[in-house]
């Protein structure tokens, strides 16, 4: 019933909304001063119909 | 039902940007998904060159990472191509794509009908 | 980057028959249970469409005469019966790993 830890993005913070990541919890990383991110700022711990939930998209990269 | 469409200058001089446009009807961009470019080149091969994420975040393809631009605006639901210093190897067909989620292990569900871009002189 | 061989290159099938395109990863597309493996049709002057999306579940409004399996580095599609409406170029695509990458297309006649 709650997806796994996304984890820490090198040179990023994140804003968690649930510290036990159930379904539709959201994370947001933000890329430190002068860092890039590539890749998707929020994620979402979606339930699937098969399966356990999991992340709508992969944790991003923070880059120089 | 989602639909997208491209629209592009046709011709693009060699060193120029080339920019397209997609315009997205019956779903808003902010709401969800990844909002992907994707060109295929004469000969057909395929090349995915990034996308926009409904959140406003980019990712790009290392390969063009120097070159390229996604941007959107959201009172116009349209997302923007924009690749810089381009060269004949640049002419193809360009697609916008509509993504499904990570967590269904997607790929591109909804497809514009594509814009010829030729780099000529 | 992930680089996608598909085979054959070209493809000859009666009607009726099977038809089977492989495409192998030059390394695994797996992550957290799924395979990361897409198949898309294409026609002349039209769009890829999406067919198969997580290696093996059919795209809704896709004939169910179209199969995928496989995982790790070695996957399949299957068309049978082929109809004549068919003939296309295949593509595999993954999107398990940045960049994003599509396979060389493999043309059924």
């Known amino acids: 019933t709650s997806c796994h830890d996304p984890g820490d993005v090198e040179h990023s913070r994140r804003l968690i909304s649930s510290p036990k990541f159930p379904v539709g919890a959201t994370v947001q990383y933000i890329c430190d001063q002068g860092f890039v991110l590539m890749g998707s700022s929020i994620l979402t711990c979606h339930d699937r119909q098969a399966g356990s939930p999991k992340w709508s998209d992969r944790a991003p990269k923070c880059l120089l | 039902d989602v639909q997208l469409q491209e629209s592009g200058p046709g011709l693009v001089k060699p060193s120029q940007s080339l920019s397209v446009t997609c315009t997205v009807t019956?779903?808003?961009?902010?709401?969800?998904?990844?909002w992907n470019w994707i060109r295929q080149f004469p000969g057909n091969k395929l090349e995915w060159m990034g996308y926009?994420?409904?959140?406003?975040?980019?990712n790009y393809n290392p390969s063009l990472r120097s070159r390229i631009s996604i941007t959107r605006d959201t009172s116009k639901n349209q997302f923007f191509l924009q690749l810089n210093s381009v060269t004949t190897e640049d002419t193809a067909t360009y697609y916008c794509?509509?993504?499904?989620?990570?967590?269904?292990?997607?790929?591109?569900?909804?497809w514009g009908q594509g814009t010829l871009v030729t780099v000529s002189a | 980057d992930i680089v996608l061989t598909q085979s054959p290159a070209s493809l000859a099938v009666s009607l009726g028959q099977r038809a089977a395109i492989s495409c192998k990863p030059s390394q695994s597309v797996d992550y957290d249970g799924d395979s990361y493996m897409n198949w898309y049709q294409q026609k002349p002057g039209q769009p890829p469409k999406l067919l198969i999306y997580a290696a093996s579940n059919l795209e809704s409004g896709i004939p169910a005469r179209f199969s995928g399996s496989g995982s790790g580095t070695d996957f399949t599609l299957n068309i049978h019966p082929v109809e004549e409406e068919d003939a296309a170029t295949y593509y595999c695509h993954q999107i398990n790993d940045d960049p994003w990458t599509f396979g060389g297309g493999t043309k059924l006649k």
């Open positions: 794509a509509r993504s499904r989620y990570y967590y269904d292990a997607y790929g591109f569900a909804y």
């Open positions: 019956g779903y808003s961009i902010t709401s969800s998904y990844t």
């Open positions: 926009i994420h409904y959140s406003g975040s980019t």
